[in-house]
Amino acid sequence: HTAAQDNCTCPTNKMTVCSPDGPGGRCQCRALGSGMAVDCSTLTSKCLLLKARMSAPKNARTLVRPSEHALVDNDGLYDPDCDPEGRFKARQCNQTSVCWCVNSVGVRRTDKGDLSLRCDELVRTHHILIDLRHRPTAGAFNHSDLDAELRRLFRERYRLHPKFVAAVHYEQPTIQIELRQNTSQKAAGDVDIGDAAYYFERDIKGESLFQGRGGLDLRVRGEPLQVERTLIYYLDEIPPKFSMKRLTHHHHHHHHHH
């Protein structure tokens, strides 16, 4: 019996089934839906998590204005195709042979087409803007305390290297967290900003992906930080390719998470 066999669970992903039949007799945890073995010492990729979810038995301005190329996930949930490493395949298709291209966080970045649609490469999302509105409080949070707490959260809970949290902006009641991670910056073993953002999004919604941990209890100097709305913008290293109709109308059609 190895220690892993005595406690064969996945701390970082509750949407797994674990058994002591991995290499070397170690505990091996498979993601629901795909059956792929996941590394339970770090975050599971968003693609495998989405697949598991679909298979399982929602004045001087300091705030960032998302660029014209920012993407919002308007398409909601879908059952994605993941590559052998668990990343999103560049081209996604549904059961009716409608296909589209996605970025590294699985968000559609082209108009929908048919099976002839080509997606040459998986385009990296290098900048994520998490836009939050917190519930009314007695007073505004201290910006530096808020900044420190959110950076601690991403470092300790999601194991994201601090250098990838580019900035925390605050203009009551809006908080913005900027995550930046270029292809060249991401070393082997680094948590992907897209995965960290997805875990954070699920935590904020009260749908924690962590095994057995309590939900997210965010506090700034003891004061609860309760989020009532989140909006996440994704910026890719190569701008998306939508028709003009989409750019003028669809861009502002946001999904709000309550």
Partner: antibody
């Protein structure tokens, strides 16, 4: 020692259903996957699906999703597979096997579908 | 699904010779490949797990190698009882699949 013992041979008519059992012993039944594999006469091995007895989470080969049902009774350490709407090409030896690398196999259950 | 292609389909060798059986996966599966021997009328028997891990009770003449997409089962010196059908199987992701088999026959 680990053993998987399967139920006996079955002869069924087309359109009928068959249920094969696999009784496990010699290990903790709930901690390992049980897989079902079949082999038609003179053919290779075909994976039907797998069940995790601890929580009865089951995964099916797309080919069998509409006709196969895998279950597990933890109280008697036994896994089952039921195949419905049988056809003549379902004639095969059905095996249960343990773990992701199929380290232990049942002796096989011959299912013959014939009118 | 991941397709496993075994070669050759049939291998004719004599006792004492070295046998090399190949299994190729349609995509990268790391080391999630396992090898089985099956004799007529019997259930398959696990020989090698995770590409190269040996199995208790299996003679040391059986060894495995490879990672990614190309895998090899080697029998260093064939014994009369080794003539059988050999299958590879992957456990990378669902659905699990088997190769079509290599029949090892006496020359």
């Amino acid at each position: 020692q680990v053993q998987l013992v399967q139920s006996g041979a079955e002869v069924k008519k087309p359109g009928a259903s068959v249920k094969v059992s696999c009784k496990a012993s010699g290990y903790t039944f709930t901690t390992h996957w049980i897989h079902w594999v079949r082999q038609a006469p003179g053919q290779g091995l075909e994976w039907i699906g797998t069940i995790f007895p601890s929580n009865a989470y089951a995964v099916y080969n797309q080919k069998f999703r509409d006709r196969a049902t895998m279950t597990a009774d933890r109280s008697i350490s036994t896994a089952y597979i039921e195949l419905s709407r049988l056809r003549s090409d379902d004639t095969a030896v059905y095996y249960c096997a343990r773990a992701s690398y199929f380290d232990y196999w049942g002796q096989g259950t011959t299912v013959t579908v014939s009118s | 699904e991941i397709v496993l292609t075994q070669s050759p389909a049939t291998l004719s060798l004599s006792p004492g010779e070295r046998a090399t059986l190949s299994c190729r996966a349609s995509q990268n599966i790391g080391t999630s490949i396992h090898w089985f021997q099956q004799k007529p009328g019997g259930a398959p028997r696990l020989l090698i797990k995770y590409a190269s891990e040996s199995i208790s009770g299996i003679p040391s003449r059986f060894s495995g190698s490879g990672s990614g997409t190309d895998f090899t089962l080697t029998i260093s010196s064939l014994e009369p009882e080794d003539f059988a059908v050999y299958y590879c199987q992957h456990s990378h992701s669902w659905p699990f699949t088997f190769g079509q088999g290599t029949k090892l026959e006496i020359k």
